[in-house]
C-alpha cells in the first residue's frame, strides 16, 4: 500500500494505491483511491507512468480528456465514471502487455488540494492449476497442468501424509511454450503416489503462486485450486 | 436509452463519394467509440474503422485506408462515414455501433438500424 | 492482422439440441472475443463479450468458452428463435476482425 500526499499548494490530499499485477491478454485494474469530493466537475485525474511522453488517462470534468494520451495506451483505458465521486480514481487497462509494466502515478486534483502516489505494475501470466489421475500411466500418477505462466514458474509438490517430503526424485515438470511464444503451459507429473492422500501442486513466479489439491480415496476424487497474487502491497 | 440513426438509403455511381450519418441519443457522445461495420447482401460482417468522437482519433481497417473518411461532429452528436471511389462490390449495408467501455474500446454494443448503399452505372 | 476463422460455415439442428460454434484467432493470445446474432434485416446483437460475459438480458442457454485462441459459443437448448447467423468478433487489437459467420438452419 502506498499512500501518497500532496507537497505543494495550501492542502494536501490522501492518494492511496496498491501494487499490483496484470495478467496479458486480459483486463488489469490499476488501483488508486483518493479523498472524495463532493462535486465531480472539481476532480482532476491523471494517470501517469514513467518512462512515458503522453498521459496513460486524464478525467476532469466529469469526463475523459484525451488529448494527452500517449499512443501506446489508446483506446486501452477507463475510469469507472460513476465511482469517481466517491474517491475511486482505480483505472481500468484493456489487453494488458508485458510492456504495461513499469511505474505508474495517480495523481489527483480537487477543490481541497492535490495529492499522488506511485504504483508499481507487474505483468507476466498466471492461470489455476488442475491436477488429476493420470490413469494411462503404468502405476499410480498424478498429472498437474496449468495452461499459461509467465515468467517461467517454479513447480512443488507436496503432500499432507509425507509433510516435508522432497518429491523432486518422483516428479518430472515440463514448460511447453505456447502458440503467441510467450506464455507458457506447465505440465507436472507425480509418481508413485498413495491413496488416502492429500497432494498439493505449487505453481510460483514472481507474479503470482497457485496450488492445485487432490484428494484421492477409494471411493472418490477430490479437486481444488486457488491462485494468490504476490506483492500486492498498498502506497 | 441509447439510440443510434442511421441516414437513409443512397445509390452511387462508380467512381462517386458517399457520406453516411449516424446520430447518437441516449449517452455521453464524447465518451464512447463508434464503430462503423459493413455487410454485402448474402456475406458476412466487416469491420472497417471506429473513432473516438472526443478526440477524433481513428482506427482504420487497412482494406479501407485511403477510401474510408471518419468524422464526428460533436455539436450535434453524429459521427459520418465518407467512402469514396466507390465500386460495385462497395453495395452493402454500413452499420453504425457504438463501442462498450467509454474511452475504453470495447465490444459493439449499440448498433444503428443501417443505411444501404448501392453502387450500380 | 489477426483473421478469425469460424466454423462451421452453417449447421442444420433441431430445437432442444445442443449446437457449438467455433472461432479460431490466426495469432495473440487475449480474452477480448465477442458473440453476435443476427437475424435477415436487422442490425446483430451482442450475446457475449470478454470470452463468457453475458450481455444483459441474453438467455443463460447461450454461453462462451476459450482461452488462448480457440473459442466457442454453446447454445445449451435451442429454442425456435435462435435460429440466425452468428458472428465471432475478436476485438483486442488495434485492428478488428470479425469470423465469416455460422448459419444457423432448421433441420
Known amino acids: 500500500l502506498i499512500i501518497g500526499f500532496g507537497i505543494s499548494g495550501r492542502h494536501s490530499i490522501t492518494v492511496t494505491t496498491v501494487a499490483s499485477a496484470g495478467n496479458i491478454g486480459e483486463d488489469g485494474i490499476l488501483s488508486c483511491t483518493f479523498e472524495p469530493d463532493i462535486k465531480l466537475s472539481d476532480i482532476v485525474i491523471q494517470w501517469l507512468k514513467e518512462g512515458v511522453l503522453g498521459l496513460v488517462h486524464e478525467f476532469k470534468e466529469g469526463k475523459d480528456e484525451l488529448s494527452e494520451q500517449d499512443e501506446m495506451f489508446r483506446g486501452r483505458t477507463a475510469v469507472f465514471a460513476d465511482q469517481v465521486i466517491v474517491g475511486n480514481a482505480s483505472l481500468r487497462l484493456k489487453n494488458v502487455q508485458l510492456t504495461d509494466a513499469g511505474t505508474y502515478k495517480c495523481y489527483i486534483i480537487t477543490s481541497k488540494g492535490k495529492g499522488n502516489a506511485n504504483l508499481e505494475y507487474k505483468t507476466g501470466a498466471f492461470s489455476m492449476p488442475e491436477v488429476n489421475v493420470d490413469y494411462n500411466a503404468s502405476s499410480e500418477t498424478l498429472r498437474c497442468e496449468a495452461p499459461r505462466w509467465f515468467p517461467q514458474p517454479t513447480v512443488v509438490w507436496a503432500s499432507q501424509v509425507d509433510q516435508g517430503a522432497n518429491f523432486s526424485e518422483v516428479s518430472n515438470t515440463s514448460f511447453e511454450l505456447n502458440s503467441e511464444n510467450v506464455t507458457m503451459k506447465v505440465v507436472s507429473v507425480l509418481y508413485n503416489v498413495t491413496i488416502n492422500n492429500t497432494y498439493s501442486c505449487m505453481i510460483e513466479n514472481d507474479i503470482a503462486k497457485a496450488t492445485g489439491d487432490i484428494k484421492v480415496t477409494e471411493s472418490e476424487i477430490k479437486r481444488r485450486s486457488h491462485l494468490q497474487l504476490l506483492n500486492s502491497k498498498a502506497s | 436509452e441509447v439510440q443510434l440513426v442511421q441516414s437513409g438509403a443512397e445509390v452511387k455511381k462508380p467512381g462517386a463519394s458517399v457520406k453516411v450519418s449516424c446520430k447518437a441519443s441516449?449517452?455521453?457522445?464524447?465518451?464512447?467509440?463508434i464503430g462503423w461495420v459493413r455487410q454485402a447482401p448474402g456475406q458476412g460482417l466487416e469491420w472497417i474503422g471506429d473513432?473516438?468522437?472526443?478526440?477524433?482519433?481513428?482506427n482504420y481497417n487497412e482494406k479501407f485506408k485511403g477510401r474510408a473518411t471518419l468524422t464526428a461532429d460533436t455539436s450535434t452528436s453524429t459521427a459520418y462515414l465518407e467512402l469514396s471511389s466507390l465500386r460495385s462490390e462497395d453495395t452493402a449495408v454500413y452499420y453504425c455501433?457504438?463501442?462498450?467501455?467509454?474511452?475504453?474500446?470495447?465490444?459493439?454494443?449499440?448498433w444503428g438500424q443501417g443505411t444501404l448503399v448501392t453502387v450500380s452505372s | 492482422d489477426i483473421q478469425m476463422t469460424q466454423s462451421p460455415s452453417s449447421l442444420s439442428a433441431s430445437v432442444g439440441d445442443r449446437v457449438t460454434i467455433t472461432c479460431k484467432a490466426s495469432?495473440?493470445?487475449?480474452?477480448?472475443v465477442a458473440w453476435y446474432q443476427q437475424k435477415p434485416g436487422k442490425a446483430p446483437k451482442l450475446l457475449i463479450h470478454?470470452?463468457?460475459t453475458l450481455q444483459p438480458g441474453v438467455p443463460s442457454r447461450f454461453s462462451g468458452s476459450g482461452s488462448g485462441t480457440d473459442f466457442t459459443l454453446t447454445i445449451s437448448s435451442l429454442q425456435p428463435e435462435d435460429f440466425a447467423t452468428y458472428y465471432c468478433l475478436q476485438y483486442g487489437n488495434l485492428l478488428y476482425a470479425f469470423g465469416q459467420g455460422t448459419k444457423v438452419e432448421i433441420k
Open positions: 455501433a457504438r463501442l462498450d467501455g467509454s474511452s475504453y474500446r470495447g465490444a459493439m454494443d449499440s
Open positions: 473513432i473516438y468522437p472526443g478526440g477524433g482519433y481513428t
Open positions: 470478454y470470452t463468457s
Open positions: 441516449g449517452y455521453t457522445f464524447t465518451s464512447y467509440w
Open positions: 495469432q495473440g493470445f487475449n480474452k477480448y
